[in-house]
């Protein structure tokens, strides 16, 4: 396969800042199915973090797919201020506080942070780099914001996101949420190029999901993560498919529409399934 | 106050097996994380296994991975090591430790006795 | 593996004198959150180890203050100011940074 012409990919100038799914489906790819029809859906977008348009073929695909561009922003977007700004309310934690610590299969182990439902803290454990599940953060504090109670036993403000009093909009914060890339399924395509724990310098390639492109990266020897692809070829083969995004002349952002097989998505989708 | 009681120690041949017990009682054992840390007769601490707090993950260095599993039983308040394809450098006493909120040992069992002899 | 060296490997100290047990480790114990997670534990004679410090300098409940820990990075010191005779034991250090985690071959403190 060819790298199909790199200069499809759009890059913004500003870095989103991290992203805290409402529901796991959120993060689905849209899948136009098998079917040939051609119906006008809508899909969440984890690269533009808004709701958007494509062409759905009838027939299977994923939950990541509205009939409305307002169920969508209902079910993936928090543009609802008063369930986002801390209430007087409970609030729930997110699915994910009450999973099992997993350091997944991997071996190259580093320090991360879980939610633990028995003692209702966030405790210290070890990740081996891989897979794993989303009650996993890089920091006690990040933990603590998603899923610890507050003190007066009301859930923090776990979504990080404060009413901007100049236009009313919702101005995400991020130091407050876990980032799109500790999804710890098989997308392993988004996440980062990690060299991992060695001393070794070997020549691999890593997706980088933010530019649609397979990049070079130096690899230790150990460790690191899935993302990692002894050839450009073979980066692109397993990632790129899908996962590009492109911007067509109406403003609209559409997916390629190949209906090669996509082991990606539907290990991706898979998982968090399984891990929800 | 926390108390963990192993068993199981024996004595047995290379290449045997030999399944070791920890009994937790004074704190809610479902809640930690917990591991197997053995000592050899020359005295030196050696890390074991490690399980999650409900049962389904397990940590091993590599000198007893695929030999030990690691497994627990929160109803119980029990936790197993399964020891096989054992070798005389796997003497040793063995302790069972509790993992505190810092992934740290905190408290140590009176320990067990596993001596691999022919 | 994460080498830990402790020195001396014997000790003997007069009671009511002070007393100094160093660890070092083969690489930086400071982890990527920030901790440093270098541990003590105490094995007095016919029993089995107790932990006395974690996180380098703090105490575990009932461990008197006469103990303390310092240090960073690779080099750790844990200090006993005026040595009592139920102190006598093996001192181990411990790090719970990096995987496995791994001991240190022991101080014996012995009373003079």
């Known amino acids: 396969d060819s790298e199909e012409d790199e200069e499809h990919t759009i890059i913004t100038d500003t870095e989103l800042p991290p992203l805290k799914l409402m529901h796991s489906f959120c993060a689905f790819k849209a899948d136009d199915g098998p079917c040939k029809a051609i119906m006008k859906r809508f899909f969440f977008n984890i690269f533009t973090r808004q709701c958007e348009e494509f062409i759905y073929g009838g027939c299977e695909g994923n939950q990541n797919r509205f009939e409305s561009l307002e169920e969508c922003k209902k079910m993936c977007t928090r543009d609802n201020a008063n369930r986002i700004i801390k209430t007087t309310l409970q609030q729930e934690k997110p699915d994910f506080c009450f999973l099992e610590e997993d350091p997944g299969i991997c071996r190259g182990y580093i320090t991360r942070y879980f939610y633990n439902n028995q003692t209702k803290q966030c405790e210290r454990f070890k990740y081996g780099g891989c897979l794993g599940n989303m009650n996993n953060f890089e920091t006690l504090e990040e933990c603590k914001n998603i899923c610890e109670d507050g003190p007066n036993g009301f859930q923090v403000d776990n979504y990080g996101t404060q009413l901007n009093a100049v236009n009313n909009s919702l101005t995400p914060q991020s130091t407050k949420v876990p980032s799109l890339f500790e999804f710890h399924g098989p997308s392993w395509c988004l996440t980062p190029a990690d060299r991992g724990l060695c001393r070794a310098n070997e020549n691999r390639f890593y997706y980088n999901s933010v530019i649609g492109k397979c990049r070079p990266f130096k690899y230790s020897g150990c460790g690191g993560n899935e993302n990692n692809f002894t050839s450009k070829q073979e980066c692109l083969r397993a990632c790129k498919k899908g996962f590009i995004q492109r911007i067509s002349k109406g403003g609209l952002i559409k997916t390629k529409r190949k209906r090669k097989k996509q082991r990606v998505k539907i290990a991706y989708e898979e998982i968090f399934v399984k891990n929800m | 106050e926390v108390h963990l009681v192993e068993s199981g120690g024996d004595l047995v041949k290379p290449g045997g097996s030999l399944k070791l017990s920890c009994a937790a009682s004074?704190?809610?054992?479902?809640?930690?994380?917990m591991s197997w840390v053995r000592q050899t007769p020359d005295k030196r601490l050696e890390w074991v296994a490690t399980?999650?707090?409900?049962?389904?993950?397990?940590y091993y260095p590599d000198s007893v991975k695929g030999r030990f599993t690691i497994s627990r039983d929160n109803a119980k308040n029990t936790l197993y090591l399964q020891m096989s394809s054992l070798k005389s450098e796997d003497t040793a006493m063995y302790y069972c430790?509790?993992?505190?909120?810092?992934?740290?040992?905190?408290?140590w069992g009176q320990g067990t006795t596993v001596t691999v002899s022919s | 593996d994460v080498v830990m060296t402790q020195t001396p490997l014997t000790l003997s100290v007069t009671i009511g004198q002070p007393a100094s047990i160093s660890c070092k480790s083969s690489?930086?114990?400071?982890?990527?959150?920030?901790?440093?997670?270098l541990n003590w534990l105490l094995q007095r004679p016919g029993q089995s180890p107790k932990r006395l410090i974690y996180?380098?300098?703090k105490l575990d409940s009932g461990v008197p203050d006469r103990f303390t820990g310092s240090g960073s990075g690779t080099d750790f010191t844990l200090k006993i100011s005026r040595v009592e005779a139920e102190d006598l034991g093996v001192y181990y250090c411990?790090?719970?940074?990096?995987?496995?985690?791994?001991f240190g071959s022991g101080t014996k403190l012995e009373i003079k």
């Open positions: 399980i999650t707090t409900g049962g389904s993950y397990t």
């Open positions: 690489q930086s114990l400071l982890d990527s959150d920030g901790k440093t997670y």
């Open positions: 411990w790090q719970g940074t990096h995987f496995p985690f791994t």
């Open positions: 430790a509790r993992q505190d909120g810092n992934f740290l040992m905190d408290y």
């Open positions: 004074g704190f809610t054992f479902s809640s930690y994380a």
């Open positions: 996180l380098v300098s």
